[in-house]
Structure formats: structure tokens, C-alpha cells
């Protein structure tokens, strides 16, 4: 429950939230579990802690490992663990299962595909969407806030959808991609 799997691609931004939630006023300390070394909070570091968030800007394969977050209230300390895996970018179009977020289902009347983890990032529209690595074009596809809406959904719309956006941190831009499967169900 208080250990969460997170994954990302090398050279992309990855932001992880401490799985142990606390009130906004509580302080959070992050450590690299294997060495018990404290993660710095200074933003000049490629990997730094920012309250509930641990930021990899950008991520490297060597960043993989378990990170400990300790949330401190005035009287209680509670621990969470983030199990982070950074993968090398695939040269082909295939997105392996281990990079996939949860599958979503849609129907003719309801076909929203939410871009996974996007709420953790400082991004601005537009959000780019791809299906099986092809950029989506045509009036049936509408990128709305953090969703893709597909009009008049057909069974052929099933497949793997990737959202791509830019995270901005202190004027620097970092790419982020996330992929999930979409299935079409009968009404």
C-alpha cells in the first residue's frame, strides 16, 4: 500500500509522488534506500526532492531503485517507498507491457482517455496524442485538457494510445510520454 511502482524513460522527466500522503503543511524527506543517502532539495540537481514530489529531470537508467519518503507531522513520522525503474528508449514502435499504464475502456457515448500521471507535471497545452506511434489526425480526435476524446468510437479505435507533453521546470523543458491501452466495449 505504501510502496508504489513508478517508471519512466531515460532522458524524459519523471516525477514521483510519495505514496504516504500527508497534510500540505507536513515536511517530506526523501532518501535513496540502498545507501540511505538524502536526496537534495536544491533545484540545480538533476534529481531533487520538492515536498511530496521526487523529480528526475531528466531520468537516467542508473536512477532505478527504491526511494524512501518520510512524511513528518509535528508528532508523527510516516514512511512510504517509491520503487522507480527507468528504461532505455525503444528503437522500434512497440511499447512493452512494463511501460503501460492501466487499460481504459470506452464506448460510443463515453470515450475519454486520460493521460496518465500528467497531474504531477507543470505542463501547458497542447497535449500530443499518438495511436500505435502514429500522430492522431482528423476531426474525430479532440485533445481536451488532459484527455483525448474520440467521437463516434468504433472497434478499430482500440489500441495503445500515447500522450506526449512538455514539463517545464525553472524555464527548462523536458519531454514526458505515457502509454495506455484503450478497449472498446458495446453499450
Amino acid at each position: 500500500k505504501f510502496s508504489k511502482q513508478s517508471w519512466g524513460l531515460e532522458n524524459e522527466a519523471l516525477i514521483v509522488r510519495c505514496p504516504r500522503q500527508g497534510k500540505p503543511s507536513y515536511t517530506v524527506d526523501w532518501y535513496y534506500s540502498q545507501t540511505n543517502k538524502s536526496i537534495p532539495t536544491q533545484e540545480r540537481n538533476r534529481v531533487f526532492a520538492s515536498g511530496q514530489l521526487l523529480k528526475f529531470l531528466p531520468a537516467r537508467v542508473a536512477d532505478s531503485g527504491i526511494y524512501t519518503c518520510i512524511v513528518r507531522s509535528p508528532t508523527f513520522n510516516r514512511t512510504g517507498y517509491a520503487n522507480v525503474t527507468i528504461y532505455k528508449k525503444q528503437s522500434d514502435c512497440n511499447v512493452p507491457d512494463y511501460l503501460m499504464y492501466s487499460t481504459v475502456s470506452g464506448s460510443e457515448k463515453n470515450s475519454k482517455i486520460y493521460c496518465p500521471t500528467i497531474d504531477l507535471y507543470n505542463w501547458t497545452a497542447p497535449l500530443e496524442w499518438f495511436k500505435n506511434c502514429q500522430a492522431l489526425q482528423g476531426s474525430r480526435y479532440r485533445a481536451h485538457k488532459s484527455f483525448l476524446v474520440i467521437d463516434n468510437v468504433m472497434t478499430e479505435d482500440a489500441g495503445d494510445y500515447t500522450c506526449k507533453f512538455i514539463h517545464n521546470e525553472n524555464g527548462a523543458n523536458y519531454s514526458v510520454t505515457a502509454t495506455r491501452s484503450f478497449t472498446v466495449k458495446d453499450e
Epitope: Q21, G22, S73, T75, F76, R78
Partner: antibody, heavy 123, light 107 residues
Framework: EVQLLESGGGLVQPGGSLRLSCAAS????????MIWVRQAPGKGLEWVSS????????YYADSVKGRFTISRDNSKNTLYLQMNSLRAEDTAVYYC????????????????WGQGTLVTVSS | EIVLTQSPATLSLSPGERATLSCRAS??????LAWYQQKPGQAPRLLIY???NRATGIPARFSGSGSGTDFTLTISSLEPEDFAVYYC?????????FGQGTKVEIK
């Protein structure tokens, strides 16, 4: 210093009503979830009801659902339990307590408790 | 609802002895388990949270362990003031539930 002080207990007939109050001091009442727990004479502890901080979402034990209502007045730093259709099995010491941590959708321990107020339901 | 079963119901020990109290959950509560101490005529007092962390001001002789469904509260060397009733409580989900209590009494 955190303090919780219950009041409003007493003797009531079956089917009657009672309103318990819990006056809180020594902490920022509005941001904490608050809980009522009861203890029948010589028995163990039973969670009765919880209320979120500023959001105000409420939760009830099945044994009191539809009969008891938990509420709070953050401007008065006071927690309430309105008890209707009281039964003999509601006889207990009622404690109010503070959840010092919980975030939306989660619960935590009870770090401060009042001294309790006795409710006796008997004809 | 998650049922917590404490054992034994009563533990008769002498001061200085080690007390081991058990709490078993009907389904996994991860580490969302607390222990309380209650003395006659008093409100419960929080001892342990998240299965193994001592609350502020609780002496080191109290320790908690376990995860999932099986938990233990250990008092390494009983002091006279430790004779009381001890309750476990889960907070992974509503309804919050307590065990029926273990009474630690003087032998």
C-alpha cells in the same frame, strides 16, 4: 495543550434523543478529522462515527446509521453527535477523539481523547 | 468489516516480566494498525502506530511488530503502571475496528 471535553450525556428513555458536544482547544480544529468512539460498561471500544475536517464528509458504523448524525462547527471548535431513536444497547461512555493525520480517503490513529460522557438508555 | 482478534484475553504476569500480546486481522491491514492502553476510568492512550512506531512520549519498553494480518505488542519488562487493558485498532478502511482487548493483570 490539546484538550477535548465532552458534554451532553445523561439518562434517556428508549426512543429518545440526546445531543453530545465536544469542545476542542489547543489545536487548529478545522483541519483535523474528528471521531466518536463508545464503550459499553465493561466492554471494548467501538467506533461510532467520523467527520472530515473542512470537507465535512461523514462516516458511520452500521449500528448507528440512520439514527445518529455527526456534525461540527469549526467557528466554535465544537464537534457534535445527535443521537435519535436511542436503544438500550447504545448505553455507553462516548468519547470524542482526534485523528491527527488522515487525508481524503484515508484514516489514522486517535492521538487525543476526551474524558468521555456517559449515556444511559433505560426506562 | 475487518475483525481484529486479540489473544490472550487475560495475561497474568509479575512486574519485570515480558508481556507479549497478539492481534490477528481477518484480512490484511498492511501496517495500518495501532495499539492503545486503557486504565480503569480513563480514556485510551495511543502507544503504537503504523504497527511498529512508538507514539510521542511512549517508553522504549513498548514495541510493536507485524504486518498484514499478524501483529504483536511487546512490553519488555512490565512496570507497575503497565497493568491495564490493551486494544489494537485497524485504520486501513472504514469502519474502523478495535480488537476486544487483552487485560494484563498482576499475577
Amino acid at each position: 495543550e490539546v484538550q477535548l471535553l465532552e458534554s451532553g450525556g445523561g439518562l434517556v428513555q428508549p426512543g429518545g434523543s440526546l445531543r453530545l458536544s465536544c469542545a476542542a482547544s489547543g489545536f487548529t480544529f478545522s483541519i483535523y478529522d474528528m471521531i466518536w468512539v463508545r464503550q459499553a460498561p465493561g466492554k471494548g471500544l467501538e467506533w461510532v462515527s467520523s467527520i472530515r475536517g473542512e470537507g465535512g464528509g461523514t462516516y458511520y458504523a452500521d449500528s448507528v446509521k440512520g439514527r445518529f448524525t455527526i456534525s461540527r462547527d469549526n467557528s466554535k471548535n465544537t464537534l457534535y453527535l445527535q443521537m435519535n431513536s436511542l436503544r438500550a444497547e447504545d448505553t455507553a461512555v462516548y468519547y470524542c477523539a482526534r485523528d491527527p493525520w488522515s487525508t481524503e480517503g484515508s484514516f489514522f490513529v486517535l492521538d487525543y481523547w476526551g474524558q468521555g460522557t456517559l449515556v444511559t438508555v433505560s426506562s | 468489516e475487518i475483525v481484529l482478534t486479540q489473544s490472550p484475553a487475560t495475561l497474568s504476569l509479575s512486574p519485570g516480566e515480558r508481556a507479549t500480546l497478539s492481534c490477528r486481522a481477518s484480512q490484511s491491514v498492511d501496517d495500518d494498525l495501532a495499539w492503545y492502553q486503557q486504565k480503569p476510568g480513563q480514556a485510551p492512550r495511543l502507544l503504537i502506530y503504523d504497527a511498529s512506531n512508538r507514539a510521542t512520549g511512549i517508553p522504549a519498553r513498548f514495541s510493536g511488530s507485524g504486518s498484514g494480518t499478524d501483529f504483536t505488542l511487546t512490553i519488555s519488562s512490565l512496570e507497575p503502571e503497565d497493568f491495564a487493558v490493551y486494544y489494537c485498532q485497524q485504520y486501513i478502511t472504514a469502519p474502523l475496528t478495535f480488537g476486544q482487548g487483552t487485560k494484563v493483570e498482576i499475577k
